[in-house]
């Protein structure tokens, strides 16, 4: 049950990060104009990875496209590849993770097909998180760069005099969206990697116990998955006893087509 | 069409204060920036400042800061600009002017006060 | 604040004649978020109050008569006037409408012969 709880929540903390990765490489507001002290301007200005923009004070909004692409700098072309890699990979993450929940039976799918992909899910979602963290910071770290050295600008020139009114930009919204979107995503993934493990049956540390039965001697031998095999085809562990003697959750938690209980 | 009606003159003492008005019909009202522009005889414009009638947010320029204080009553679609402590340098007409809805220029201007500081 | 500096002042024409006044401000009025400049020219008839010729330092307002031209970008700008008429007798003023406090020029008084 704790497993199904893991791995659901896992699925849904990730899915909301990538809705918010999709929504903030999306947004406009990744740079807006910095309007500490009063704003210097008349018109307020913001820019996402798409499109820069411009708000009149009179309310009257116009955006203009990128209509460059090798015009542009290097880094916000580094930004808008990670954001999208971060989405491409979050979005075959969703798609394997749904078929790995537990609560969903496809055919006779196996435990261990369904930890593997568990597994694989919460890899990509870890590092489309990762990507989305990047990318984000990326942009941050090139905005406080950017807003210093317009500062040092504004205060240069003859006798420290102000020669220039330069318009400076912060943080936008979309930074924050990001930031929290690809903290999600990897949480999700992450706890889909810890669902994986439970998924997994284990191998068990009992000792071989020889149970006599009326009639026939027969041993039955202590198995189950490896651990270490890495959910891999399971040719070499297949349990080789029809019953035996196991807690309700081990019952519960690793039901394969050889348990008949 | 948007007019902007304002008294043709005011005559104050030096030291007293007036509120020179301007009533704005022909559009919507708490949509546009209402901005005051002082003129003194034979010289140029300058910008006194803007207040925005439908949250009352206000940009001043920092030379009036203080002599001027602009206000707005939404019910009568009127804007109102207060001038404090006059002395004879504060005679001058002033207009209000409505502002542009894609850029930030007067589009229409009111007739203007003729403010008139003496003893 | 910034300074908007016209010239020339007077300008005495005759009534056909194309007439060019400069304005020249501080410092750029480009704005690099929509590529626009925001310098207004108005015109102020005697006894009358200002009325808006050009704003975007190119954009003509509705109703005014073509033979007015605004051009320019960043800190340098001009307004053309391509056959001057003995109506055009005004005081033409630009306007800084970009950074806080908005600033006008001194003004250009068109003369007419």
């Known amino acids: 049950m704790a497993v199904t709880a893991c791995q659901g929540l896992g699925f849904v903390v990730s899915l909301i990060g990538i809705a918010g990765i999709i929504a903030a490489t999306c947004m406009d507001q990744w740079s807006t104009q910095d309007l500490y002290n009063n704003p210097v301007t008349a018109v307020f200005n913001y820019q996402g990875l798409w499109r820069s923009c411009v708000r009149e004070s009179s309310g009257f909004t116009e955006c203009r496209g990128y209509f460059t692409l090798l015009g542009l700098p290097a880094m916000l072309q580094a930004v808008r590849a990670l954001m999208i890699v971060g989405i491409v990979l979050g979005a075959i993450g969703l798609l394997v993770s749904i078929f790995a929940l537990k609560c969903i039976r496809i055919g006779s799918m196996e435990d261990s097909a369904k930890a593997n992909m568990t597994l694989t899910s919460g890899i990509m979602f870890i590092v489309s998180g990762l990507c989305a963290i990047a990318g984000v910071s990326v942009f941050a770290n090139m905005l406080v760069t950017n807003f210093w050295m317009s500062t040092a600008n504004m205060y240069t020139g003859m006798g420290g005099m102000v020669q220039t009114v330069q318009t400076r930009y912060t943080f936008g919204a979309a930074l924050f969206v990001g930031w929290v979107a690809g903290g999600l995503t990897l949480i999700g993934g992450v706890m889909m990697c810890i669902a994986c493990r439970g998924l997994a049956p284990e191998e068990t540390n009992y000792k071989a116990v020889s149970y006599h039965a009326s009639g026939h001697s027969v041993a039955y031998k202590p198995g189950g998955f490896k651990a270490s095999t890495g959910f891999g085809s399971n040719t070499k562990n297949k349990k080789i006893y029809d019953g035996g003697a196991r807690t309700e959750d081990e019952v519960q938690s690793y039901p394969s087509k050889h348990d008949y209980v | 069409q948007v007019q902007l009606q304002q008294p043709g003159t005011e005559l104050v003492k030096p030291g007293a204060s007036v509120k020179v008005s301007c009533k704005a019909s022909?559009?919507?009202?708490?949509?546009?920036?209402m901005h005051w522009v002082t003129q003194r005889p034979g010289q140029g414009l300058e910008w006194i400042g803007r207040i925005r009638p439908s949250d009352s947010d206000s940009n001043y320029n920092q030379k009036f800061k203080g002599k001027a204080t602009l206000t707005v009553d939404k019910s009568s679609d009127t804007a109102y600009m207060q001038l404090n402590s006059l002395t004879s340098e504060d005679s001058a007409v002033y207009y209000c002017?409505?502002?542009?809805?894609?850029?930030?220029?007067?589009?229409?201007w009111g007739q203007g006060t003729l403010v008139t500081v003496s003893a | 604040d910034i300074v908007m500096t016209q010239s020339p002042s007077p300008l005495t024409v005759t009534a056909g004649e194309k007439v060019t006044m400069t304005c020249k401000s501080s410092q750029t009025l480009l704005n690099r978020g929509n590529q626009k400049n925001y310098l207004t020219w108005y015109q102020q008839k005697p006894g009358q109050p200002p009325k808006l010729l050009i704003y975007?330092?190119?954009t003509r307002e509705s109703g005014v008569p073509d033979r007015f031209t605004g051009s320019g970008s960043g800190t340098d700008f001009t307004l053309t006037i391509n056959s001057v008429q003995a109506e055009d007798l005004a005081v033409y003023y630009c306007?800084?409408?970009?950074?806080?406090?908005?600033?006008f020029g001194s003004g250009t008084k068109l003369e007419i012969r």
């Open positions: 022909g559009y919507t009202f708490t949509t546009y920036w």
């Open positions: 306007q800084n409408d970009y950074f806080f406090p908005f600033t």
């Open positions: 975007w330092a190119s």
């Open positions: 002017a409505m502002g542009a809805y894609f850029s930030n220029s007067f589009a229409y």
